[in-house]
């Protein structure tokens, strides 16, 4: 058993049929010695008396808010949560496996630049009685500070019969140099509590590996005289690291109709303009990627050909 | 501790081309190592990230773009003194700081060159003959060093009398290649910045 936060404790249980469970001793936080009784949750049934209460925690029915009272007055609370371990593996029931970039990916993180700011998100089908707490650091043995905000519900989607909820959190490394060469990864730890179930999820990454620039901005078309070719120009996204001559991007320019199966024109360039062939009912799209370290491409920025 | 904005004339920066070749060569070599050593811990997640130049050179700090010198977090540098001549310095107005930056890059290359050559000598003794260093990568390191053209004491190639542990050597190769790729990215960014200045 360990303390998650003040008056909240996590009991780690091997989860299998007829498991013996864990013996837990609760102590009432009071100077009083006599006349103390214990109850669980909203029940008025007295579970025991005395300053300590010993319980055998085997299942979710044994978890919950234990309260010690004296003469009708509440003295203190202890909330017990369960963390299940099945076949030596901690349960991952609360969050959905996003399977990208690999299986057992519960947390996904992205950074728009090298400033040390990043966003992580996760998915769940659970809609109520759900809380998340996020901690992060650079390295684990001698951790350096990363400050994370509160996790918030950022999107709701309908997937078949199910509703899916996306939560996200923003974090900022306390003292980040955009030009630094990372040798210790960022560690992100998410504590998830659903009713009386506790789970924790972790992700470890270098900022350089989770870079995904914003799409290029200010796309403009200039038809070339006596030609079917069009000069398309754009600018670096505002959120990208500066100076741009140091943090350079490379671009992919594509002309395509509405369907992905349609024919297309495609060209790659390090410049902020390119010449392509425009077709009726097609769109010109441009996306960006770090020129020197190939992490993710940005989303497309698009303008219609006409 | 920073690069001035008005340095070489545009297009007069001969090291840019070499630094692009360097990044390409080390990336190819790393990809080859990952594929060939698929049953060894050779991915970014699996290896320890070591920097053989740590406390010996200060490339990131010495080559910091002027715009980043206002960032307190970028200025915790170790001072290192270097020789200040070199053919990539395309203008007489080149500042001492730029010379410091380029000589720091030169020292990095020299250290990695020695490590890679020593390692290749060991890998050539491996009866499995599983992996060797790409001669192209070693040649590209050499070309960039020549373009930088700093006078510097030659570092003797480390020789070892004991039997090499080939497993450890291959793990170390992965560690070195990952670190060298990150440094090659920095070098490419620096050269691009100087070329644009």
């Amino acid at each position: 058993i360990w303390e998650l936060k003040k008056d909240v404790y996590v009991v780690e249980l091997d989860w299998y049929p007829d498991a013996p469970g864990e013996m837990v001793v609760l102590t009432c936080d009071t100077p009083e010695e006599d006349g103390i009784t214990w109850t669980l949750d909203q029940s008025s049934e007295v579970l025991g008396s005395g300053k300590t209460l010993t319980i055998q925690v085997k299942e979710f029915g044994d978890a919950g808010q234990y309260t010690c009272h004296k003469g009708g007055e509440v003295l203190s609370h202890s909330l017990l949560l369960l963390h299940k371990k099945e076949d030596g593996i901690w349960s991952t029931d609360i969050l959905k496996d996003q399977k990208e970039p690999k299986n057992k990916t519960f947390l996904r993180c992205e950074a728009k630049n090298y400033s040390g700011r990043f966003t992580c998100w996760w998915l769940t089908t659970i809609s109520t009685d759900l809380t998340f707490s996020v901690k992060s650091s650079r390295g684990s043995s001698d951790p350096q500070g990363v400050t994370c905000g509160a996790a918030t519900l950022s999107a709701e989607r309908v997937r078949g019969d199910n509703k899916e909820y996306e939560y996200s959190v923003e974090c900022q490394e306390d003292s980040a140099c955009p030009a630094a060469e990372e040798s210790l990864p960022i560690e992100v730890m998410v504590d998830a509590v659903h009713k009386l179930k506790y789970e924790n999820y972790t992700s470890s990454f270098f900022i350089r590996d989770i870079i995904k620039p914003d799409p290029p901005k200010n796309l403009q078309l200039k038809p070339l005289k006596n030609s079917r070719q069009v000069e398309v120009s754009w600018e670096y996204p505002d959120t990208w690291s500066t100076p741009h001559s140091y943090f350079s991007l490379t671009f992919c320019v594509q002309v395509q109709g509405k369907s992905k199966r349609e024919k297309k024109d495609r060209v790659f360039t390090d410049k902020t303009s390119a010449t392509v062939i425009c077709r009726k009912n097609a769109s010109i799209s441009v996306r960006a990627q770090d020129r020197y370290y190939s992490s993710s491409w940005s989303e497309w920025a698009s303008v219609p050909c006409s | 501790r920073n690069l001035p904005v008005a340095t070489p004339d545009p297009g007069m920066f001969p090291c840019l081309h070499h630094s692009q070749n360097l990044l390409r060569a080390v990336s190819n070599m790393l990809q080859k190592a990952r594929q060939t050593l698929e049953f060894y811990p050779c991915t970014s997640e699996e290896i320890d990230h070591e920097d053989i130049t740590k406390d010996k050179t200060s490339t990131v700090e010495a080559c910091l773009p002027l715009e980043l010198t206002k960032n307190e977090s970028c200025l915790n540098s170790r001072e290192t003194s270097f020789i200040t001549n070199g053919s990539c310095l395309a203008s007489r107005k080149t500042s001492f700081m730029m010379a410091l930056c380029l000589s720091s890059i030169y020292e990095d290359l020299k250290m990695y060159q020695v490590e890679f050559k020593t390692m290749n000598a060991k890998l050539l003794m491996d009866p499995k003959r599983q992996i060797f260093l790409d001669q192209n990568m070693l040649a590209v390191i050499d070309e960039l060093m020549q373009a930088l053209n700093f006078n510097s004491e030659t570092v003797p190639q480390k020789s070892s009398l004991e039997e090499p542990d080939f497993y450890k050597t291959k793990i170390k190769l992965c560690i070195l290649l990952h670190a060298f790729r990150i440094r090659a990215v920095t070098i490419d960014r620096v050269m691009s910045y100087l070329n644009a200045s």
């Epitope: 079917r228 199966r261 024919k263 297309k264 790659f268 062939i277 | -």
Partner: antibody, heavy 118, light 107 residues
Amino acid sequence: QVQLVQSGAEVKKPGASVKVSCKASGYTLTDYYLHWVRQAPGQGLEWMGWIDPENGDTEYAPKFQGRVTMTTDTSTSTAYMELRSLRSDDTAVYYCNANKELRYFDVWGQGTMVTVSS
Amino acid sequence: EIVMTQSPATLSVSPGERATLSCRASQSISINLHWYQQKPGQAPRLLIYFARQSISGIPARFSGSGSGTEFTLTISSLQSEDFAVYYCQQSNSFPLTFGGGTKVEIK
């Protein structure tokens, strides 16, 4: 699968014209760009131009501008390349090729040998 | 127009050995570079597109790399069916242009 079948070999006199055909099967002609590339005996490859069968748009290499015409007949799924004012150095194998991407060549025809000789 | 230069013109390699073919562009073309294989009496066949993207059905021993002005096609272990002429082609701008080719022959 996508296939391109070209017309047979031709022998032409200098100053004459030649029209090579390229019949597409296994796909709808308008779904792909169509290029023509030639190869003189023992020489390398030379791009001549492309046509978008969907709208008839064309782009020719400057070297062939004014001397070449590329057309398509969607009803028969056939593309044509006509080269006029033939010279002896136009002796080559002429290939048609198709791709959903405009700038490289995925599916090639078997080639048509055109000999220009007096 | 962009001039593509391939080297060497002829490469003599023993079966099982590694072959490295080079292609250089007269100006920077990013990764707009494609590789083809041509055997005598046959039409060319696309091997690699956009410098390093492999084509399904093409053996994994063929790989491409490079960007800017310098590109490489590597055949990791030459098989008898790989002896042919290899062409690079740029698609950075029109007119599309090919290199002069590299003939890979048996040593």
